[in-house]
């Protein structure tokens, strides 16, 4: 199931790149699958928020994105995330790339990786 989530993530990143006009030489932070959840591409200065993934949720391939961005671009996301919510993890897109997640997954979500036997 997590391989499927990863594949869905890569598809969503590709669609987001098209929407945002991103390519390999674009400044900013590329979308990525960090083995827990999916992060969409972002411009430098943007903060991207994701909610803690439900461990066995199957991605809806019709949903363009499930994250909220604070910054220049906004995709009109279906769920409005806020830094004042619990169970929300953020990353900043800096000139040096993505920051570490804050809070760390284990503190925000109660887990920090999918179990190895799953």
């Amino acid at each position: 199931i997590f391989k499927k989530e990863q594949a869905m993530c890569l598809e969503k990143i590709q669609r987001a790149n098209e929407l945002m006009g991103f390519n390999d030489s674009s400044p900013g932070c590329p979308g990525m699958w960090d083995n827990i959840t999916c992060w969409k591409p972002a411009h430098v200065g943007e903060m991207v928020l994701v909610s803690c993934p439900e461990l066995f949720r199957i991605f809806n391939p019709d949903q363009v994105w499930e994250t909220e961005t604070i910054g220049e671009s906004d995709f009109g996301d279906s769920n409005s995330l806020d830094l004042s919510d619990m169970g929300v993890v953020s990353r900043n897109c800096t000139e040096d790339g993505w920051s570490e997640p804050f809070p760390h997954y284990f503190d925000a979500c109660g887990f920090d990786e999918y179990e190895s036997e799953t």
């Epitope: 619990m86 503190d107 887990f111 920090d112 190895s116 036997e117």
Partner: antibody, heavy 123, light 107 residues
Framework: QVQLQQSGPGLVKPSQTLSLTCAIS??????????WNWIRQSPSRGLEWLGR?????????HYAVSVKSRITINPDTSKSQFSLQLNSVTPEDTAVYYC?????????????WGQGTLVTVSS | DIQMTQSPSSLSASVGDRITITCRAS??????LNWYQQKPGKAPKLLIY???MLQSGIPSRFSGSGSGTDFTLTINSLQPEDFATYFC?????????FGPGTKVDIK
């Protein structure tokens, strides 16, 4: 009900290793919903979280930076217990040491504690 | 590390009083905050987790509130067994850090 029973010496010489054990009853050290923590308390430093071990298909540890170079927390699945080792102790490590179970519900919290062990570091 | 401060450091109260203890975090911690009670010679006991969730078995006279950086623990109708020291603890970022404590004694 969950109970944590601590054991270990109350006096350790400077530069030696502090070793404590926490025996778990009413739960398992391999419980995939729990973490197993060590905390200490002294008049000068107050309550200080030292680290934890937990099992999620494999064993993992988190340690406080202040003791990271000196601390080891090990589980013992055969006895359902976990231990603390703190190397190269100094008198500043004198404290009451507690083990505690961590559980998750919106955040991590410590819901069951051992009775505490006063460890004095002195020659 | 996130620094936690508490006020007051001690307070005197009578049975039946309503008391409030304040905890402040040095940075934004959403509601990743726990409260513990400790009596002399004993281990801390969990009262409140996630800022306002009452731990199972804890009397409803205890309540927690707040978010961001400022939090409060309120005890309505203080009982004789409530005279103790109270600690807050942040759980958003390791190392988890505790406040210095508020000692509640009998007036």
């Amino acid at each position: 009900q969950v109970q944590l029973q601590q054991s270990g010496p109350g006096l350790v010489k400077p530069s030696q290793t502090l070793s404590l054990t926490c025996a778990i009853s009413g739960d398992s050290v391999s419980n995939k919903q729990a973490t197993w923590n060590w905390i200490r308390q002294s008049p000068s430093r107050g309550l200080e979280w030292l680290g934890r071990t937990y099992y999620r298909g494999k064993w993992k540890n988190h340690y406080a930076v202040s003791v990271k170079s000196r601390i080891t927390i090990n589980p013992d699945t055969s006895k359902s217990q976990f231990s603390l080792q703190l190397n190269s102790v100094t008198p500043e490590d004198t404290a009451v040491y507690y083990c505690a179970r961590g559980m998750w519900n919106q955040n991590w919290f410590l819901d069951h504690w051992g009775q505490g062990t006063l460890v004095t570091v002195s020659s | 590390d996130i620094q936690m401060t508490q006020s007051p450091s001690s307070l005197s109260a009578s049975v039946g009083d309503r008391i409030t203890i304040t905890c402040r975090a040095s940075q934004y911690i959403v509601r990743y905050l726990n409260w513990y009670q400790q009596k002399p010679g004993k281990a801390p006991k969990l009262l409140i987790y996630a800022a306002n969730m009452l731990q199972s078995g804890i009397p409803s006279r205890f309540s927690g509130s707040g978010s961001g950086t400022d939090f409060t623990l309120t005890i309505n109708s203080l009982q004789p067994e409530d005279f103790a020291t109270y600690f807050c603890q942040q759980a958003i970022n390791q190392p988890y850090t505790f406040g210095p404590g508020t000692k509640v004694d009998i007036k």
